[in-house]
Interface confidence: low
């Protein structure tokens, strides 16, 4: 065994949208750190085996398997996959260590299986196994975080049952609005599941595993805040659980709170209250309303009232099964070339929604906005002022939501022109859709003006990537025109575009824009 | 959809003066530039006006000082204001909403 060579096996991920990963087997430029696979002898195998870790992929994700090999002199090497040879392209390192490569792109069921690897050195022959499997994520889940009182302490525990098992983490933040956001120096994120500090302006709760991340807000009403225009409302549906809490500040410790339900105080054992002094010395207190599990008789209005304070309520609002409010109606757009326009969708929905914009079947990222009316918008405006059509979808656990756009982008005619022995086309995309006319050049209309109406067909045709019309003029060829020149031009209320198009000449066709 | 319904034209005399409306249904009217065509007997359609969503008006230069377009968010509805109409302004009248065409309307213009 003295003279086996040193093996490192490595898996190298890559992003998706990763344009170094090749086509071939052949060595790509590195796109995330490499994973050891371990790469250890096989024991009581016939020759020499090596195994690398069984390596386990997401469904179109795009992998390299690699081995580095430690050896003296040149090798040969193969690969096999289900009895087929692959092409082999060894290289070598800049610590001249051999580096044979197998790239993976975008990981199907039938890619899954085991690849072999035979190489051949001065020295010596070896085979390296690699077990690549599709990871089952058919059994993942991602659900929202939920809140449950800690038994015997007043303390919140946070939970959210998803598998894989999901890294829960609290995200507080202790000032108003804007500055809350995730990436503000005003946040603090705790990655535990109790959370025992309650009095902070904003808590929520998030999970996180493989399939991504979702939060849990923790609803609040602040007596100290001017209340909304409108109502805040909290949805939730049947057998979830309810979370509410009420918040005060005052100058002493003489005041109470209270939570009523359409009128009614809340039961004993459906709420439970804290409070503490802050840095100024001022009181705050929280009173906390819930119900383990919600039924439809749980929805009214949920009343906070304090001795010091004015009132104020939420509506809540239990569904049997989730939604997504907004106007599906298609709408169109005109905008000129250079201005600032973003499409954007008004929506309620519950749970929240995931989305994506998608154009020419390109997707982007979708981000939500909350109003204080309690709807969410959504703005897209990275459409680089391209014309088409642009989707808006979005889905819950419940519910599905497909808006279409149109965006047209005001410019003046491009003229392209194509001839053949017996016709010559003009075609254009500017907007508003152009209308055409052609013109006959001779000795007795020098200037093109001379109009022709006769064997002239215009239409206009969809083209269908961009969901983009675009507008074609065809001229039939009479003898009246062979071997003329003659002009099409496409005119919108921004502009006219002309091409001049010999007809009928030997050779290809020159084409003279003129605008 | 977008449905236009163009109307206010007719018969009057050189020298005088006519309010064309183009009113529209869908959403979509007050974020969309208007557009005033016109199209004369045996003659190609021309562009006469347009009115952008923010309200900037831009003309047909040998029309400027004639024609005024406006609109009425409120009402979903374009003007276009004629005046010391020309027996040469005789022609049907379209207002435009993206690919949108009204039915247009008559104006007739006598000397």
């Known amino acids: 065994n003295q003279d086996l060579p040193v093996i490192k096996c490595v898996l190298i991920n890559h992003k998706n949208n990763d344009s170094s990963v090749g086509k071939s087997s052949s060595y790509p430029m590195v796109s995330e750190s490499p994973e050891d696979l371990g790469c250890a002898l096989r024991p009581q195998s016939s020759g020499t085996v090596y195994e690398a870790a069984a390596v386990e992929v997401d469904v179109s994700a795009s992998i390299t398997l690699q081995v580095l090999v430690d050896a003296p002199g040149n090798i040969s090497c193969l690969w096999v996959f289900k009895h087929s040879s692959l092409n082999c392209q060894p290289h070598f390192d800049l610590q001249n260590r051999g580096v044979v490569s197998m790239v993976i792109l975008k990981m199907t069921e039938t890619q899954a299986g085991e690849y072999l690897l035979f190489i051949q050195s001065e020295a010596t022959n070896y085979t390296i196994l690699f077990t690549v499997s599709i990871r089952n994520t058919l059994l993942y889940t991602l659900r929202r975080p939920y809140f449950r009182k800690m038994e015997n302490q007043d303390a919140l525990v946070c939970i959210s049952e998803s598998v894989p098992e999901p890294i829960v983490e609290w995200v507080l933040c202790d000032s108003q609005g804007e500055s809350c956001k995730e990436e503000s120096p005003a946040v603090v994120k705790k990655e535990e599941k109790v959370l025992h500090e309650l009095f902070g302006t904003d808590i929520r709760c998030c999970a996180r595993n493989e399939l991504g991340r979702e939060c849990t807000r923790l609803f609040t009403i602040d007596l100290n805040q001017t209340p909304q225009t409108t109502l805040p409302q909290l949805f939730l549906k049947v057998g979830e659980p309810l979370w509410i809490r009420c918040k005060a500040v005052h100058v002493n410790h003489g005041f109470g709170l209270t939570w009523e339900l359409e009128n009614k105080a809340l039961e004993e054992g459906n709420y439970f209250e804290m409070s503490t002094y802050s840095t100024n010395r001022t009181m705050i207190r929280i009173l906390f309303a819930f119900v383990s599990s919600v039924a439809r008789n749980d929805t009214g209005y949920y009343t906070c009232s304090s001795s010091k304070h004015p009132s104020q309520s939420a509506l809540v609002t239990i569904v049997e099964k989730g939604f997504i409010n907004a106007t599906n109606s298609s709408e169109d757009y005109e905008i000129d070339q250079y201005e600032e326009f973003c499409f954007s969708v008004r929506f309620k929905a519950y749970p929240q929604i995931r989305c994506t914009w998608t154009f020419s079947r390109k997707s982007f990222p979708c981000e939500q906005k909350g109003l204080d009316n309690g709807y969410s918008i959504s703005k897209f405006c990275n459409h680089k002022h391209q014309p088409g059509e642009y989707i808006f979808h979005a889905e819950n656990d419940d519910a599905q939501f497909t808006k279409m756009f149109t965006l047209n982008i005001r410019r003046k005619p491009q003229v392209l022109a194509e001839a053949s022995a017996s016709q010559a086309s003009c075609f254009s995309d500017g907007y508003p859709l152009p209308s055409w006319t052609w013109k006959k050049c001779s000795d007795k209309s020098p200037n093109c003006t001379e109009e022709i109406t006769e064997g002239v067909w215009n239409r206009k045709a969809n083209r269908k990537v961009f969901g983009q019309w675009v507008s074609s003029s065809t001229l039939n060829m009479s003898e009246a025109i062979k071997g003329f020149l003659v002009k099409c031009c496409a005119y919108n209320s921004l502009g006219t575009s002309c091409e001049t198009i010999l007809l009928n000449s030997p050779g290809p066709f020159p084409f003279i824009q003129d605008n | 959809q977008v449905q236009l319904q163009e109307s206010g034209g007719g018969l009057v005399q050189a020298g005088g003066s006519l309010r064309l409306s183009c009113s529209a249904s869908?959403?979509?009217?007050?974020?969309?530039?208007i557009d005033w065509y016109r199209q004369a007997p045996g003659k190609q359609r021309e562009w006469v006006a347009q009115?952008?969503?923010?309200?900037?008006?831009h003309y047909e230069p040998s029309l400027k000082g004639r024609f005024t377009i406006s609109r009425d968010n409120a009402k979903n509805t374009a003007y276009l204001q004629m005046n010391s109409l020309k027996p040469e302004d005789t022609a049907v009248y379209y207002c435009?909403?993206?690919?949108?065409w009204g039915q247009g309307t008559q104006v007739t213009v006598s000397s």
């Open positions: 435009r909403i993206l690919d949108y």
């Open positions: 009115i952008t969503s923010g309200g900037n008006t």
């Open positions: 869908g959403s979509t009217f007050s974020r969309n530039y």
